[in-house]
Amino acid sequence: MNGRVDYLVTEEEINLTRGPSGLGFNIVGGTDQQYVSNDSGIYVSRIKENGAAALDGRLQEGDKILSVNGQDLKNLLHQDAVDLFRNAGYAVSLRVQHRLQVQNGPIGHRGEGDPSGIPIFMVLVPVFALTMVAAWAFMRYRQQL
């Protein structure tokens, strides 16, 4: 049975201050370690308890990290991405893509599905338009009676 999972995709700038044990998260991905099919991006695999990221609360497991201190993470080897974080300094600015699931359906491992999804407005706008047209038609019909 093939289901479809739709996502609301949002971006956010997250500024973290490195704590005593660092930034407090793990990553997967890179050109040599694709985690999502046809996407060599860097994803948050683990948020460490009581770490800087966990205490801040905005970064989530599954988020895609687009840049670190303005440096793009596209087309990087996994270890190069790790090194970039480790050398990022005390104040670290992350550009992050959140993906919120808005419709349940069968889904496998993140790496096995289509990561793109559909932004929710793509679904809501046509539904809203159809509703308005139907309401207008109904009102016209009533006026003719």
Partner: nanobody
Framework: HVQLVESGGGLVQPGGSLRLSCAAS????????IGWFRQAPGKEREGVSC????????YYADSVKGRFTISRDNAKNTVYLQMNSLKPEDTAVYYC????????????????????WGQGTQVTVS
């Protein structure tokens, strides 16, 4: 359900060898860093060796460099620790641990980064 099971420990004479195995179930090793740690009576748990989640880079504590070798077999979902030229000071309970992805903060020899631990296997060199 993530589970790690160590085996291969035992009693060995100084200069002898042992091969420890860490069998993983409930997940595949592909995206996991795996570490071997040990704890001797009355001492803190220390990192022995680990293998990264990405390119299979290996790391060793200074005390075991040149004597211990870590390797992974993704097909068997198992990580091995080959221990040669064993010394009495290698006596400890040996644990394997797994962590999803790579920590952006520290190398895989840092035991605080690991989420999943096995029950341990006793190694005695005497």
């Amino acid at each position: 359900h993530v589970q790690l099971v160590e085996s291969g420990g035992g009693l060995v004479q100084p200069g002898g060898s042992l091969r420890l195995s860490c069998a993983a179930s409930g997940f595949t090793l592909d995206y996991y860093a795996i570490g071997w740690f040990r704890q001797a009576p009355g001492k803190e748990r220390e990192g022995v060796s680990c293998i990264s989640s990405s390119d299979g880079s290996t790391y060793y504590a200074d005390s075991v460099k040149g004597r211990f070798t870590i390797s992974r077999d993704n097909a068997k979902n198992t990580v091995y620790l080959q221990m040669n030229s064993l010394k009495p000071e290698d006596t400890a309970v040996y644990y394997c641990a797994a962590d999803f992805g790579s920590s952006v903060d520290s190398t895989c020899l840092n035991n605080q980064q690991y989420d999943y631990w096995g029950q341990g296997t006793q190694v005695t060199v005497s």
